[in-house]
């Protein structure tokens, strides 16, 4: 009878053990072990047992011990089971980020691993257990589908394998994978709504102002503001899911013409982007042209009106004939004309409003002077002693110089307050002298006596 | 469709004068800034002068400043380039580009026209 | 300075996908636009603004950019997409309206 010990082992891969094979017999004519194993006969005294060390054990294997004895031939076999654990564990690699609301697939690899009925495969969120079965397959895979939430943002998902050979007098081989964080994110399915103008004047500054609401996390989110293909550096502020991006923009003479505004918000691996068109224009005043912004009186003024070449023009109220960006009108100039304001209104229709500009110039038209009847009357009879104020008006552009004298020395003080006396009595010669010429015109002053009863 | 189609090319000694012309169509001539941009035998592109849409501004690049002319007439949907005092290195193919905007990238090429300066 | 940088040169195996890279100044305060010329042929716009493509242009084109650097990728080159690649954009200095780089030659094996 044979007989072997130990008859059952557990061992680590690669690992050896000493096995004993022994037979009833004193003297067996033959013992021994049939193994492919590396093995080594230590000696001892006796015939009837012998041990071996069989090494490097990668696999279960099962030695048979042998024995031929006068009665007969018999075996006996020990079992070897090899334990190690899994070569490889990990998640199956998923984008880091994941919106919320969408079933999130996790599956986990398990490479190797013995003996598997011992193997358990445990997905976690961080301690939490998601789902553990036993390895099958090789590799093992398992698999779970999570709904993602928004308070899974920043949790760690994780694969473990569990080696249970505490049953076997061992303990309980953990083996974990590599940590996946999930990073939920809410990008609502609305487009950032972005304000600015829809008009801007070449040499001026716009505001714009790109905001979305029901955003998680807020503070993660990319605004990419944009006016052509200028990048705008906004200020953002952050309320608890909004954002509100804020830039300035000023253009120049090189964006005139149609740019696209675009608001571009990245979260995860998604992004919402708002187009706008924004039109910059050019659109200096009108101009004014006199043909002399002064000329004397009876002159022909031709005023002429020009404007950007789309525009409308009315000049003093009057549009262009044809309508366009050109008008004129002729005038003899005449001293109603002196002061006389030319306005041009220029409009300019850009993506579909109305800009208006206006220029004004003033007309100085040089005549006179003028003395007449109305502003300095020939004819003034005045009380002795009573307080007059002499009035005599020249007329004129420029003003006339006036100087009214009797007998070529006296003068009559216009303007000023006097006490009439027989010597103001008279005919004074009133002369009023400009750059455009003179004119004379008498004057008398009559004094009247007082009456005594 | 939009097509921009160069003319006015050909042969000239150095110091004389040419003069290109861009014909447009399919697309809002006025409305659009329009650029010469010019490439010489085996070489890379290199942007020339620009113009706004109305015609109230024009750019030049400094190699060609005070010797060419960009206008442009809106009534007839043409661009022009006139070419002065020209240059061996300005022997080039010469493509008229269009943009939304002056400063804008190039939305519609012509095919181009060849100028050769040369004795 | 006012000057795009651009390798002369690069290939790309047929289906493969190959970057072309574009450096400047002008990068920092504007996007590039990329025109592919092929042989005997007017440039054509392939990408403009942060990453958009004009209708026509397959969706294989896409543009990025970084700092400044503005770069072109070609996912799954054809045999068609075998020509000079130009970035090009806004001066910043000044000197210019736009500026173009030196452009890239792709070979496509």
């Known amino acids: 009878q044979t007989s072997v010990s130990p008859s059952k082992v557990i061992l680590p891969r690669g690992g050896s053990v000493l096995v004993t094979c022994s037979t009833s017999c004193d003297q067996p004519k033959l013992l021994g072990i049939e193994t492919p194993l590396p093995k080594k006969e230590l000696l001892l005294p006796g015939n009837n047992r012998k041990v071996y060390e069989l090494s490097n054990v990668q696999e279960d294997s099962q030695p048979m011990c042998y024995s031929n004895c006068p009665d007969g031939q018999s075996t006996a076999k020990t079992f070897l089971t090899v334990y190690w654990t899994p070569e490889r564990v990990e998640l199956a690699p998923l984008p880091s980020w994941q919106p919320v609301g969408k079933n999130l697939t996790l599956r986990c690899q398990v490479e190797g691993g013995a003996p598997r009925a011992n193997l358990t495969v445990v997905l976690l969120r961080g301690e939490k257990e998601l789902k553990r079965e036993p390895a099958v397959g090789e590799p093992a895979e398992v698999t779970t589908t999570v709904l993602v939430r928004r308070d899974h943002h920043g949790a760690n998902f994780s694969c473990r394998t569990e080696l249970d050979l505490r049953p076997q007098g061992l303990e309980l081989f953990e083996n974990t994978s590599a940590p996946y964080q999930l990073q939920t994110f809410v990008l609502p399915a609305t487009p950032p709504q972005l304000v600015s103008p829809r008009v801007l004047e070449v040499d001026t500054q716009g505001t714009v102002v790109c905001s979305l609401d029901g955003l998680f996390p807020v503070s993660e989110a990319q605004v990419h503001l944009a006016l052509g293909d200028q990048r705008l550096n906004p200020t953002v502020t952050y309320g608890n899911d909004s954002f509100s991006a804020k830039a300035s923009v000023s253009v120049t003479a090189e964006d005139e013409g149609t740019q696209r505004l675009t608001c571009a918000v990245i979260l995860g691996n998604q992004s919402q982007e708002t187009l706008q068109t924004v039109t910059i224009y050019s659109f200096p005043a009108p101009n004014v042209i006199l043909t002399k912004p002064e000329v004397s009186e009876g002159t022909e003024v031709t005023v002429k009106c020009e404007a950007h070449p789309r525009a409308k023009v009315t000049l003093n109220g009057v549009p262009a004939q044809p309508l366009g960006p050109r008008a004129q009108l002729l005038l003899k100039a005449t001293p109603e004309d002196n002061g006389r304001s030319f306005s041009c209104s220029a409009t300019l229709e850009v993506a579909g409003q109305l800009i208006h500009k206006n220029q004004t110039r003033e007309l100085r038209v040089l005549y006179g002077p003028r003395l007449d009847e109305r502003d300095c009357p020939g004819n003034w009879t005045w009380p002795e002693n009573s307080q007059q104020t002499p009035m005599c008006q020249a007329w004129g552009n420029p003003l006339p110089e006036l100087k009214c004298l009797k007998d070529g020395t006296f003068p009559l003080p216009i303007g000023e307050s006097v006490t009439v006396t027989r010597d103001l009595e008279g005919t004074y010669l009133c002369r009023a002298r400009s750059t455009q010429g003179e004119v004379t015109r008498k004057v008398t002053v009559n004094v009247l006596s007082p009456r005594y009863e | 469709q939009v097509q921009l189609v160069e003319s006015g090319g050909g042969l000239v000694q150095p110091g004389g004068s040419l003069r290109l012309s861009c014909a447009a169509s399919?697309?809002?001539?006025?409305?659009?800034?329009m650029s010469w941009v010019r490439q010489a035998p085996g070489k890379g592109l290199e942007w020339v002068s620009a113009?706004?849409?109305?015609?109230?501004?024009?750019y030049y690049a400094d190699s060609v400043k005070g010797r060419f002319t960009i206008s442009r007439d809106n009534s007839k949907n043409t661009l022009y380039l006139q070419m002065s005092s020209l240059r061996a290195e300005d022997t080039a193919f010469y493509y008229c580009?269009?943009?939304?905007?002056?400063?804008?990238?190039?939305?519609?090429w012509g095919h181009g026209t060849l100028v050769t300066v040369s004795s | 300075s006012s000057e795009l940088t651009q390798d002369p040169a690069v290939s790309v195996a047929l289906g493969q996908t190959v970057k072309i890279t574009c450096q400047g100044d002008?990068?920092?305060?504007?996007?590039a636009s990329w025109y592919q010329q092929r042989p005997g042929q007017a440039p054509v716009l392939v990408i403009y603004?942060?990453?958009s493509r004009p209708s026509g242009i397959p969706d294989r084109f896409s543009g990025s950019s970084s700092g400044n650097t503005a770069s072109l990728t070609i996912t799954g080159a054809q045999a068609e997409d075998e020509a000079d690649y130009y970035c090009?954009?806004?001066?910043?200095?000044?000197?210019?309206?736009?500026?173009f780089g030196g452009g890239t030659k792709v070979t496509v094996l």
């Open positions: 090009n954009s806004r001066d910043s200095s000044g000197n210019h309206l736009r500026v």
């Open positions: 603004g942060e990453n």
């Open positions: 580009a269009n943009s939304a905007y002056t400063g804008g990238w190039y939305d519609y």
């Open positions: 399919g697309f809002t001539f006025s409305s659009y800034a």
């Open positions: 113009i706004s849409g109305s015609g109230g501004s024009t």
């Open positions: 002008s990068l920092r305060t504007y996007y």
